[in-house]
């Protein structure tokens, strides 16, 4: 009598996550009588995958009718495969008895599951930073298999090199995750800049997945302040201008102080954007010179994006003969102008 053979023709089978996998198994003889069972893994810790006689295996169906007389095909189909199904599957013949005795195992079929990486998620720094500072962006993608993957970072189309990338776990696993950190040095021109994390994997049909982050979320461009006085008007009123330029984000509060006392507070809103994404804002203050006996110290105080206030001061000269000041120019009035940033 020829010895019974359990034939698993495929050494390995690859399937895409979500698909079905067919694991083939035939036996060379109907003798001896006894059931066939499918296991994942070998040894004492093996996991029962399918047993015709008993148990509930909702995702596993026999390929041919196992109750059919003289059936020698014990192939199974596993539906809706996930990376967790990866492993080596054994078709095992038992001799009928009490209990049944394991007689022979097939050589095993290794099931590998190919799974696409999730869309990369890019996160930036929790707090804004100013130009010349370095900020870190993190990119994460999960659930892919096999492990081989490439990740590249770009800023405005140029590949970044200050990058650290890890694929976990290091050993064999059903699926993998990638996490990468890119360090970017900010410039004042980066309001409209973008960083892109690009992930390429064998399962993607030639097109990398991309995650993006806008540097506008990470950058703060502090304003430049300039306080100037226009020519004195005939009615003894002086127009003083505070120009706040090249700032981002728009969140800005401007306060005028006359001799240290708050005169007016304004909030920036609905400002037109500069080409580079920054904003400009101009505020005017009319000072009635005839109402003052002494020089007036005007301060333009700007609080930008929750940062400590920045001041720029300007002294308006009050003369003993105010009427003669009508022709004075701004330059002639700069005597003791204070232009310090406090």
């Amino acid at each position: 009598e020829e010895e019974l053979q359990v034939i698993q023709p495929e050494k390995s089978v690859s399937v895409a996550a979500g698909d079905s996998a067919t694991l083939n198994c035939t036996v060379s003889s109907l003798i001896p009588v006894g059931p066939i069972q499918w296991f994942r893994g070998a040894g004492p810790g093996r996991e029962l995958i399918y047993n015709l006689k008993e148990g509930h295996f909702p995702r596993v169906t026999p390929v041919s009718d196992p109750t059919k007389r003289n059936n020698m095909d014990f192939s199974i189909r596993i539906s809706n495969i996930t990376p967790a199904d990866a492993g080596t599957y054994y078709c095992v013949k038992f001799r009928k008895g009490s209990p049944d005795v394991e007689l022979k195992s097939g050589a095993g079929t290794e099931l590998s599951v190919r799974a696409k990486p999730s869309a990369p998620v890019v996160s930036g720094p929790a707090v804004r930073a100013t130009a010349e500072h370095t900020v870190s962006f993190t990119c994460e993608s999960h659930g892919f298999s096999p492990r081989d993957i490439t990740l590249k970072w770009f800023k405005n189309g140029n590949e970044l090199s200050d990058v650290q990338t890890n694929v976990d776990p290091a050993g064999k696993s059903v699926s993998y995750s990638i996490r990468s950190t890119a360090r970017v040095v900010l410039t004042r021109r980066d309001v409209h800049s973008q960083v892109i994390c690009e992930v390429a994997h064998v399962t993607l049909q030639g097109d990398p997945l991309r995650g993006t982050a806008n540097l506008s979320e990470a950058i703060r461009v502090p304003p430049f302040l300039e306080v100037t006085q226009q020519s004195m008007r005939a009615d003894n009123q002086v127009n003083v201008t505070c120009q706040v330029t090249k700032f981002y984000p728009q969140r800005l509060q401007l306060t005028w102080l006359e001799n240290g006392n708050v005169s007016r507070t304004e909030m920036a809103s609905a400002l037109p954007e500069n080409k580079d994404g920054t904003y400009n804002w101009t505020s005017w203050l009319l000072v009635n010179v005839s109402a003052h006996r002494d020089d007036v110290k005007l301060t333009c105080q700007v609080e930008h994006d929750g940062q400590p206030a920045v001041n720029k001061s300007f002294s308006v000269k009050v003369s003993a003969h105010p009427k003669e000041q009508g022709s004075n120019t701004a330059a002639e009035n700069t005597g003791t102008n204070e232009r310090n940033i406090y």
Epitope: S12, V15, A16, D148, T150, V202, T203, Q205, G206, D207
Partner: antibody, heavy 117, light 109 residues
Framework: KVEESGGGLVQPGGSLRLSCAAS????????MGWVRQAPGKGLEWVSI???????YYASWVNGRFTISKDNSEGMVYLQMNSLRAEDTAVYYC?????????????WGQGTTVTVSS | DIVMTQSPDSLAVSLGERATINCQAG??????LAWYQQKPGQPPKLLIY???TLESGVPDRFSGSGSGTDFTLTISSLQAEDVAVYYC???????????FGGGTKLEIK
């Protein structure tokens, strides 16, 4: 299936445009490629185009060839310029596998390109 | 570019005997290796991908093994219809480029 056309005899320095008609699947879901085989020689990868239309080329192509596609028509093209005698070959259009881009599982019968004066 | 070296260039094996063809990659390609069979006047036919996965409809006398840089195609019991040229093909996941081996001509002894 895939089917190539457009091959023929061309003089050195000339141009030729090969076409590949794909049926039974959507070009927007698969990478398509061109592989060539010189007479009596082995297979040589030429180019692929991604599902979204990004082109990739073998390093020796040096800008002489351009791959493109029309998803709605189900066509893939290989524009070959500045042809040389060594470009004489059977050019196969092939589709990568459904599980990944690492293998070609559907091949056309090929179209013959002869570069000679 | 990755260079794929196939050996031997030609091979003669008796019917029913085992045939073994080797393929070596110039650098690691992990398991991204495919094997093709090409008969005269026909396009290549995919046999095996991902080093050891048998393509649907391919007889199970064909098997593949290996990873990294060294790979093997085995025909366990040669049949007359297996006479053909066999090619290995790599895909490099970093450069995203392909390369073919030079081919092995398999004949019956």
């Amino acid at each position: 299936k895939v089917e190539e056309s457009g091959g023929g005899l061309v003089q050195p320095g000339g141009s030729l445009r090969l076409s590949c008609a794909a049926s039974g699947f959507s070009l927007s879901s698969y990478v398509m490629g061109w592989v060539r085989q010189a007479p009596g020689k082995g297979l040589e990868w030429v180019s692929i185009i991604s599902s979204s239309g990004s082109p990739y080329y073998a390093s020796w192509v040096n800008g002489r060839f351009t791959i493109s596609k029309d998803n709605s028509e189900g066509m893939v093209y290989l524009q070959m310029n500045s042809l040389r005698a060594e470009d004489t070959a059977v050019y196969y259009c092939a589709r990568v596998g459904p599980l990944g881009v690492d293998y070609f599982n559907i091949w056309g019968q090929g179209t013959t390109v002869t570069v000679s004066s | 570019d990755i260079v794929m070296t196939q050996s031997p260039d030609s091979l003669a094996v008796s019917l029913g005997e085992r045939a073994t063809i080797n393929c070596q990659a110039g650098q690691s390609i992990n398991s991204y290796l495919a094997w093709y069979q090409q008969k005269p006047g026909q396009p290549p036919k995919l046999l095996i991908y991902y080093a050891s996965t048998l393509e649907s409809g391919v007889p199970d006398r064909f098997s593949g093994s290996g990873s990294g840089t060294d790979f093997t195609l085995t025909i366990s019991s040669l049949q007359a219809e297996d006479v053909a040229v066999y090619y290995c093909q790599s895909w490099h996941y970093i450069s995203r480029s392909y390369a073919f081996g030079g081919g092995t001509k398999l004949e019956i002894k």
